[in-house]
Structure formats: structure tokens, C-alpha cells
């Protein structure tokens, strides 16, 4: 039997090709030169090496590049990327968007793995900010990417990048994230006319303050209930019945179905019952007529 460290006669690899598919792990180790592998990395992804065979190829590259792989190799890792650990990836310097795309393609259709998260982190930090092209790419592969960032990380997103954001990219964002994104979106879309502006800003409105909602109520926007239910409660509470009616337009009838849910429930509690009755929806729970409303929070602020 051939000693496991020696390459059998005639099996030394002259190039990376399909015949290597039949090599046992020890044969790959003994018969494939690491430098040859590195220079022909573009061929590796064209050959369906098994997961176990990829272990050997990775080991060879690790020995050749102990400080981290060069981008010329990273770009062609293909399925070998699945074998990389976050620790491996932290040694890389990925600057090309094409390299990023190539590696994300390998993981396509899967959850964002720790490896992918580390890769993206390295890439974005290298660029200094989350530019539009990068955001375009990341949200195409991971619609939930934006909402996986902390408010601090989101603060590095330039307003110009907001144009790349689709409504579904914000589905899992919480209010703290929308608080950061909304002002950027407002800035990005400021030169659009009323109806176009509303279409673009709508998915960011979970971060909008009261004064912006009041302004929107003057523009016949007909906000749907789903959007209204995502608004910040503290931004909705000061709105008058007339303002909510204008804001929702024909969708105002939907308030009845949502009267037990926030922010509608809390808003109802702040309105005069008389004013609620003008909607003709049978909303109950408003302030009875003749009662005086004291805003204690305002009083505390004044003292």
C-alpha cells in the first residue's frame, strides 16, 4: 500500500481538472501543489469537489497564505467559501464588489451565516460607509440585511444609499432603526412631488415625528392602515381626529378593526369622545364631554 504522504506514481496533478474528483483526500493532499491550486482557483468552482475534498484544498491554501488569502484567490473561492470560518475571513482584505457578489452567490438562498456576516462587516468597514452599490447588492441577497444593523451602524448609511432600499428590506426593522433611517430618507426624497414622495417615504414612516405626520395629513396621501399601525405611538398621540381623518382618507374606516391595538387604542384614549363620534365609526373610549384634559408631562417640563 502506498504511504499516505507520497503521491502515487503518475497521479501528480499538472493542472486543476475534473480528474481530481476521484482523488481520495490523502491523494489530493499529496498530489496537488498549493501554488498550482492558488493560480488555478478559477477552475475549482467548475469542479464539484465534495465537502470533504474541499477540506484538503482549504488546508493547502491556509498553508500557502497563513496571513490570509489575497483577493485574487478569494474572488474564485466559490463553494470553498463555505469552508471558511469567521476567523479566516477576518484576515482578508476584500475591496471589490465583484468579489463580494461572487461569495454571496455561493450562500444564496440560505440564512445569513456568521461567515457571510463577517465578510460583509469586513467589506463595509474597508469602504468606510455603506454606499448605494453595496447596499443594492446586500439587500438583493438578504432583504433583511438593513434591519440586522444596529442604529449606530445605520448612521453610516449616506442618504443617497436610501434609493436602493425596497419596502421589503425594512420589514423587520424596529422603531430605533427607523428613527435613524427616516431622516435620511426624508433628505434623499426631498425633491420629489407629493404623491411620489409619499410612495417612497411610506415604508420609513415608522421613524417619523408628529410634525411630519401633520404635514402629510395636509397632502391627501390616503395612508393605509398597515402603515398607520407601524407609526410611533408617541408621534400619533398628538394628532387630532381631523388630522388622522385626512391622513387616512378612505382608509379611516379601518380604525374600528384596530381600536384595541396600539397606536390606535392609545390615540383614542387621548381624543374627545365628541370628536371621535364625528367619524361615525362607533369608536369608544375617548374623553367624555365636559372633562378637562391636563397634560402633566407639559406641566412638569414647564416647572
Amino acid at each position: 500500500e502506498v504511504e499516505k504522504t507520497a503521491c502515487p506514481s503518475g497521479k501528480k496533478a499538472r493542472e486543476i481538472d475534473e480528474s481530481l474528483i476521484f482523488y481520495k483526500k490523502w491523494e489530493l493532499e499529496a498530489c496537488v501543489d498549493a501554488a498550482l491550486l492558488a493560480t488555478q482557483m478559477d477552475r475549482v468552482n467548475a469542479i464539484p469537489f465534495t465537502y470533504e475534498q474541499l477540506d484538503v484544498l482549504k488546508h493547502k491554501l491556509d498553508e500557502l497564505y497563513p496571513q490570509g488569502y489575497p483577493e485574487s484567490v478569494i474572488q474564485h473561492l466559490g463553494y470553498l467559501f463555505l469552508k471558511m470560518s469567521p476567523e479566516d475571513i477576518r484576515k482578508w482584505n476584500v475591496t471589490s464588489l465583484e468579489t463580494l457578489k461572487a461569495l454571496l452567490e455561493v450562500n444564496k438562498g440560505h440564512e445569513m451565516s456568521p461567515q457571510v456576516a463577517t465578510l460583509i462587516d469586513r467589506f463595509v468597514k474597508g469602504r468606510g460607509q455603506l454606499d448605494k452599490d453595496t447596499l443594492d447588492t446586500l439587500t438583493a441577497f438578504y432583504p433583511g440585511y438593513l434591519c440586522s444593523l444596529s442604529p449606530e451602524e445605520l448612521s453610516s448609511v449616506p442618504p443617497s444609499s436610501i434609493w436602493a432600499v425596497r419596502p421589503q428590506d425594512l420589514d423587520t426593522c424596529d422603531p430605533r432603526q427607523l428613527d435613524v433611517l427616516y431622516p435620511k430618507a426624508r433628505l434623499a426624497f426631498q425633491n420629489m412631488n407629493g404623491s411620489e414622495y409619499f410612495v417612497k417615504i411610506q415604508s420609513f414612516l415608522g421613524g417619523a415625528p408628529t410634525e411630519d405626520l401633520k404635514a402629510l395629513s395636509q397632502q391627501n396621501v390616503s395612508m393605509d392602515l398597515a402603515t398607520f399601525m407601524k407609526l410611533r405611538t408617541d408621534a400619533v398621540l398628538p394628532l387630532t381626529v381631523a388630522e388622522v381623518q385626512k391622513l387616512l382618507g378612505p382608509h379611516v374606516e379601518g380604525l374600528k378593526a384596530e381600536e384595541r391595538h396600539r397606536p390606535v387604542r392609545d390615540w383614542i384614549l387621548r381624543q374627545r369622545q365628541d370628536d371621535l363620534d364625528t367619524l361615525g365609526l362607533g369608536l369608544q373610549g375617548g374623553i367624555p364631554n365636559g372633562y378637562l384634559v391636563l397634560d402633566l408631562s407639559m406641566q412638569e417640563a414647564l416647572s
Epitope: 483526500k25 465537502y51 463553494y79
Partner: antibody
């Protein structure tokens, strides 16, 4: 959804050749390696080899080398497996199958099979 | 080539009872093992991969286990529709090889 539809049963004489087709639909034909597997009556499964429809690259199992030819026609999303110099022990159901993740070569989708009978 | 040896060749189990099928690899294959179910007149269907990961839509009564050289497919509570031939396959290295199959019947 992914579908692999194979050609009908064949009866061949020893020494002849047979060409089995496999029409793919429901996915991008050039994206996945197409494998061929055969099953002799009442027997286990035997892997024969693969072709990548995008590059036409092929790999054949040693046992079939020189007798098998795998080809594709991208324009009609169809793969072919031709086996020549047939012997009676080539009587089997021949399956085409695709593997979604090449590094994990498990057979995710199979054709319905084509029975090839070799008899004099 | 890696040889996959399945046992038993056939198995008869009462409805609702547990069925266990074994597969032994001639070399260490890690967890690179898949299991297939083949009903009469049909093509095989993937049940389990990575030795223990259930394929989409496979009922949880099917469980795979093992690593290295010894693998097991267990059906916790046999149903009438589980009557079939079951095959193991290794994908640790090429050529890809299968077990000879275990025919599962109702007692």
C-alpha cells in the same frame, strides 16, 4: 417546480447502443450538474457520471469509461446519456438526477426512469 | 471505492412499531450520508442528508443518525405509506456509492 421527464422504454440487442433523454423544466438548466444513475432489476443504485450543462464538462465512472457519452442540448433543456456496446447486464432502469449543491452530492430531484432491456 | 453495506436486506414491522435500518461504510465518510425511499414503480426520493438532516417535507417520524462508518435510519412509528425500499448513499468521495437497499414491509 423542478421536473425531469425521461424518454420511453427501449429494447436493444447486445452490441447495440441506446440513447436516453431527460428534459428538464422548472429551473435554470445550465445551473446544476446532471447525473445519471442506473438500477438493475431488483438491485441497488449505481452512479454513472455527470455532465455540467453550462460547460459540457463530463465525468464518467471508471466502470463505464469508453462506453458512455453524456451530452446536452441547451436550446431544449435536455440531457442525453448514450451507452454503447450493450450487454445483457446493462438491462436496468436509467435515471437522470440533479444535485442542487455540488459540494453535497445528494440527489435532490430524479427523473421517472427509463427501462432499457438488452436481450437477443 | 467506498462500499456501503446495508442490513437487513428486508424487514417486516407492525404498523405503529419502530423500524431500524443500518448502513456501514467501508471507510470513514464523516457525516456525508444520505437516505432515500423508493416505492414500487417510482424513482427514489431523498429523505435524509448529512446523516441526520431531514429533507423538506419529510415527516419527523424519519430520523437519521451516525457518523464515521456506522449509520442508522429509524422510522419511529411505521405507517402503511412507508412500505418501500430504503437506500443509503455516501457522498464523501467519488464515485458516489449506494447500499444495496432494505425492503421494508408490514408484518
Amino acid at each position: 417546480q423542478v421536473q425531469l421527464v425521461q424518454s420511453g422504454a427501449e429494447v436493444k440487442k447486445p452490441g447495440a447502443s441506446v440513447k436516453v433523454s431527460c428534459k428538464a423544466s422548472g429551473y435554470t438548466f445550465t445551473s446544476y450538474w446532471m447525473h445519471w444513475v442506473r438500477q438493475a432489476p431488483g438491485q441497488g443504485l449505481e452512479w454513472m457520471g455527470w455532465i455540467h450543462p453550462n460547460s459540457d464538462n463530463t465525468i464518467y465512472y471508471e466502470k463505464f469509461q469508453g462506453r458512455v457519452t453524456m451530452t446536452v442540448d441547451k436550446s431544449i433543456s435536455t440531457a442525453y446519456m448514450e451507452l454503447s456496446r450493450l450487454r445483457s447486464d446493462d438491462t436496468a432502469v436509467y435515471y437522470c438526477a440533479i444535485i442542487i449543491t455540488p459540494v453535497v452530492p445528494k440527489f435532490d430531484y430524479w427523473g421517472q426512469g427509463t427501462l432499457v432491456t438488452v436481450s437477443s | 471505492d467506498i462500499v456501503m453495506t446495508q442490513s437487513p436486506d428486508s424487514l417486516a414491522v407492525s404498523l405503529g412499531e419502530r423500524a431500524t435500518i443500518n448502513c456501514k461504510a467501508s471507510h470513514d465518510v464523516g457525516t456525508s450520508v444520505a437516505w432515500y425511499q423508493q416505492k414500487p414503480g417510482q424513482s427514489p426520493k431523498l429523505l435524509i442528508y448529512w446523516a441526520s438532516t431531514r429533507h423538506t417535507g419529510v415527516p419527523d417520524r424519519f430520523t437519521g443518525s451516525g457518523s464515521g462508518t456506522d449509520f442508522t435510519l429509524t422510522i419511529s412509528s411505521l405507517q402503511a405509506e412507508d412500505v418501500a425500499v430504503y437506500f443509503c448513499q455516501q457522498y464523501s468521495s467519488y464515485p458516489l456509492t449506494f447500499g444495496a437497499g432494505t425492503k421494508l414491509e408490514i408484518k
